[in-house]
């Protein structure tokens, strides 16, 4: 798990600077993610404390496996409540492959376009949640560089559940997902033992995303 997240008293005034963020969550919905309820619980806990609205934070969700689906665009919902209802309804689309590079690239090229609600001059944040090595990892380096060129801040989350269930080494997988995260990696990369443990990173992830508003 990521190293210590330091919270000091001086962080409080960050909350007085409520600027805007465009956040796209890129969810691995391939067959190996189980139980899906843990993913929707994670989304609920993360999103319920966000200030979602057309002049505040906007959230879009992209799901990928073999293919990519835009679950909803950044400008689809104009309140936290609406987003929470929509996020609860997201179903696992499945797929035998984990096309992480495709998912990230689609989010960059499509989800972060003005046509889908992205706002000019607003900080872009991508949260990538996946449970396995990508089948298109040869494309990852280029895709991540493209995100970097467009100033997209990336938080990546590695779910180790399928590896732990199969008693497999996680080393290569963790390295891949670390490579997706923005620098400094220790502030942008998370790993959890299984899907159920996703909720145990929500608070730290939320604070880190929220801190971006002030930078």
């Amino acid at each position: 798990v990521s190293p210590t997240f330091q919270v000091v008293n001086s962080i409080a005034p960050v909350q007085e600077c409520s600027t805007q963020l465009d956040i796209v969550i890129v969810l691995d919905g391939s067959n190996s993610i189980y139980p899906w309820d843990s993913v929707t619980a994670f989304l609920n806990d993360l999103l319920e404390r966000m200030d979602i609205g057309p002049k505040q934070t906007q959230v879009g969700i992209v799901q990928y496996g073999e293919n990519v689906t835009h679950e909803f665009n950044l400008n689809k919902y104009s309140s936290t409540e609406e987003v929470l209802v929509a996020a609860k309804k997201i179903v696992q689309r499945g797929g035998r492959q984990t096309m992480t590079a495709l998912g990230i690239d689609t989010a960059r090229k499509e989800a972060f376009t003005e046509a889908r609600g992205a706002r000019r001059g607003v900080k872009k944040v991508m949260v990538i949640v996946t449970d396995g090595e990508s089948h298109d990892n040869h494309r990852l380096k280029k895709v991540i560089q493209d995100c970097e060129d467009e100033n997209i801040q990336r938080f990546s989350i590695a779910i180790l559940g399928s590896y732990n269930r199969g008693n497999l080494s996680t080393e290569k997988f963790v390295e891949e997902i670390k490579s997706i995260a923005s620098e400094p990696t220790e502030k942008h990369f998370f790993n959890v033992s299984d899907e159920l443990a996703l909720v145990t990173i929500v608070k730290t992830l939320g604070e880190r995303i929220f801190a971006l508003e002030a930078t």
Partner: antibody, heavy 120, light 113 residues
């Protein structure tokens, strides 16, 4: 300096509703979640829920679901808590309290408390 | 819900002596992603609102005297008043913020012997 000033004591009959307000000053009201906590006579502290003053989003403790409504008026930096269908065991001191971080809910500033007495 | 259990219910300590209050949670409140314990301590005096003393289990709130200290990890926590003063007579509560609903211990009343 940060201050949370609550409305005055209330006496209500069972079945009625009560509304307690909490006026914030000395900080940016919309930047910090406001929580409500109560303490019944001779009892401990009990969390009721929070409101995000910026978005109006709420999270209520299961025990109070359907009976509590938390609202805010950003123009006057005031959060309010309404509890309906009052019972005698709702007699308590009700506090508003501010959380300094968004996702980690310790409570750094508290209102002075509002005594609500429910009696027939 | 996480249940917080405090002990003892009350405590009588001589002025200048050490007072120790225990708090136990029904599950770990150690937040693994930041390696911090989501536990706070409050002081409650009659007719006054609660006052925050400690958060992250051991971080003293600004302005709180250094005779107050917090320790512990996981499920077992302690608030220590190293040298009890007359103004420390109060009821002390622990609170977890690992998950909602936020829950408090039952309180420990500290008196002077």
């Amino acid at each position: 300096q940060v201050q949370l000033v609550q409305s005055g004591a209330e006496v209500k009959k069972p079945g009625a509703s009560v509304r307690v307000s909490c006026k914030a000053s000395g900080y940016t009201f919309t930047g910090y979640f406001m929580h409500w906590v109560r303490q019944a006579p001779g009892q401990g502290l009990e969390w009721m829920g929070w409101i995000n003053p910026n978005s109006g989003g709420t999270n209520y403790a299961q025990k109070f679901q359907g009976r509590v409504t938390m609202t805010r008026d950003t123009s006057i930096s005031t959060a309010s808590m309404e509890l309906s269908r009052l019972r005698s065991d709702d007699t308590a001191v009700y506090y508003c309290a501010r959380a300094p971080l968004r996702y980690f809910d310790w409570l750094d500033y508290w209102g002075q408390g509002t005594l609500v007495t429910v009696s027939s | 819900d996480i249940v917080m259990t405090q002990s003892p219910d009350s405590l009588a300590v001589s002025l200048g002596e050490r007072a120790t209050i225990n708090c136990k949670s029904s599950q770990s409140v150690l937040y693994s992603s930041n390696n911090k314990n989501c536990l706070a301590w409050y002081q409650l005096k009659p007719g006054q609102p609660p006052k925050l003393l400690i958060y992250w289990a051991s971080t003293r709130e600004s302005g709180v005297p250094d005779r107050f200290s917090g320790s512990g990890s996981g499920t077992d926590f302690t608030l220590t008043i190293s040298s009890l003063q007359a103004e420390d007579v109060a009821v002390y509560y622990c609170q977890q913020y690992y998950s909602t609903p936020l829950t408090f211990g039952g309180g420990t009343k500290v008196e002077i012997k």
